[in-house]
């Protein structure tokens, strides 16, 4: 039985040209996290495998940085980065948990700075 829950940063905003940390946290389960995939819509951004380390998709390697932890840092943000992001946790023995984050990249300094994991 899957008892865990994914906590995410929810809806966040950031300024064009800036950086943002995407962060998910799996709680309420003792399951072992074996791999976390980060996806933007249907496009793979990165994989963090407990044994093999990080795989950053070559298309994003110049502006995606691994971490902190199982999170992902997006750099040099553009308006095109606006959209849904998913963290997909592969766990043993529970199976797969998915979390969703919505990122809005804003043109000017109207971006909110209250997001819990946002880089100032």
């Amino acid at each position: 039985m899957m008892t865990g829950t994914i906590e995410t940063t929810g809806n966040i905003s950031a300024e064009k040209g800036g950086s943002i940390i995407l962060q998910c946290h799996l709680s309420s389960t003792t399951a072992q996290v074996t791999q976390v995939n980060w996806e933007q819509q249907d496009q793979l951004l990165a994989i963090c495998n407990a044994d093999l380390g990080w795989h950053i998709s070559p298309s994003f390697k110049d502006r995606v940085a691994p971490g902190p932890g199982l999170g992902l840092t997006l750099q040099s943000l553009t308006v095109n980065d606006t959209g849904e992001y998913f963290c997909i946790y592969h766990t043993y023995p529970d199976g797969t948990y998915t979390g969703r984050i919505f990122l809005e990249v804003l043109e000017s300094s109207v971006a909110e700075h209250g997001a819990r994991f946002q880089i100032p």
């Epitope: 044994d51 795989h55 298309s59």
Partner: antibody
Framework: QVQLQQPGTELVKPGASVKLSCRAS????????MHWVKQRPGRGLEWIGR????????KYNEKFKSKATLTVDKLSSTAYMQLSSLTSEDSAVYYC????????????WGQGTTLTVSS | DIQMTQSPASLSASVGETVTITCRVS??????LAWYQQKQGKSPQLLVY???TLAEGVPSRFSGSGSGTQFSLKINSLQPEDFGNYYC?????????FGAGTKLDLK
């Protein structure tokens, strides 16, 4: 087009070390991780490890941790694997292989270097 | 380590036939499985990754399926260039491991 160029053969003596090379071309070398795989006749394929050419960070199969050392030279877009304390068990074909776009599989392989350890 | 059991070990078939190679895995690897073809004296070539996604340039007569612990590679209407060795590999944990291979030869 993507190419991974490896020397065809290497002949070395038992107890010595050897540094195998893999020169990459046709793509941005630092954007793709590189894997190394060992193949012996009748023994199938064995994964040795992978390296991030951008950071130099590597991960090894526990079995090869004390045998293989992976490095890169970004300027020449070349990946290297040094094998130490060679024995006849190390005689094999060694392949470098580029990691794919979507995970830890390998999408392009070099032609392989046949390593012979013999006195 | 994750164990990969490939079957059959060898297979004889004729041009135009359809064949299926299977790979059984010792634990759940979701869909993180690749298939490679290797011809005598050559390096392996990627056919399929993520269990069912065909690699660039691979003919559509090849298809991969399965998830969890059971996977298969199907080749429809065998062509002369399809004969050789086939390997499955999981791409999910350390160490990455390969099946022992299936030798496909001409009947």
């Amino acid at each position: 087009q993507v190419q991974l160029q490896q020397p065809g053969t290497e002949l070395v003596k038992p107890g010595a070390s050897v540094k195998l090379s893999c020169r990459a071309s046709g793509y941005t070398f630092t954007n793709y991780y590189m894997h190394w795989v060992k193949q012996r006749p009748g023994r199938g394929l064995e994964w040795i490890g992978r390296i991030d050419p951008d950071s130099g960070g590597s991960k090894y199969n526990e079995k090869f941790k004390s045998k293989a050392t992976l490095t890169v030279d970004k300027l020449s877009s070349t990946a290297y694997m040094q094998l130490s304390s060679l024995t006849s068990e190390d005689s094999a074909v060694y392949y470098c292989a580029r990691e794919g776009h979507y995970g830890f599989y390998s999408d392009y392989w070099g032609q392989g270097t046949t390593l012979t350890v013999s006195s | 380590d994750i164990q990969m059991t490939q079957s059959p070990a060898s297979l004889s078939a004729s041009v135009g036939e359809t064949v299926t190679i299977t790979c059984r895995v010792s634990e759940n690897i979701y869909s993180y499985l690749a298939w490679y073809q290797q011809k005598q004296g050559k390096s392996p070539q990627l056919l399929v990754y993520n269990a069912k996604t065909l690699a660039e340039g691979v003919p559509s007569r090849f298809s991969g399926s399965g998830s969890g612990t059971q996977f298969s590679l199907k080749i429809n209407s065998l062509q002369p260039e399809d004969f050789g060795n086939y390997y499955c590999q999981h791409h999910y944990g350390n160490p990455l491991t390969f099946g022992a291979g299936t030798k496909l030869d001409l009947k």
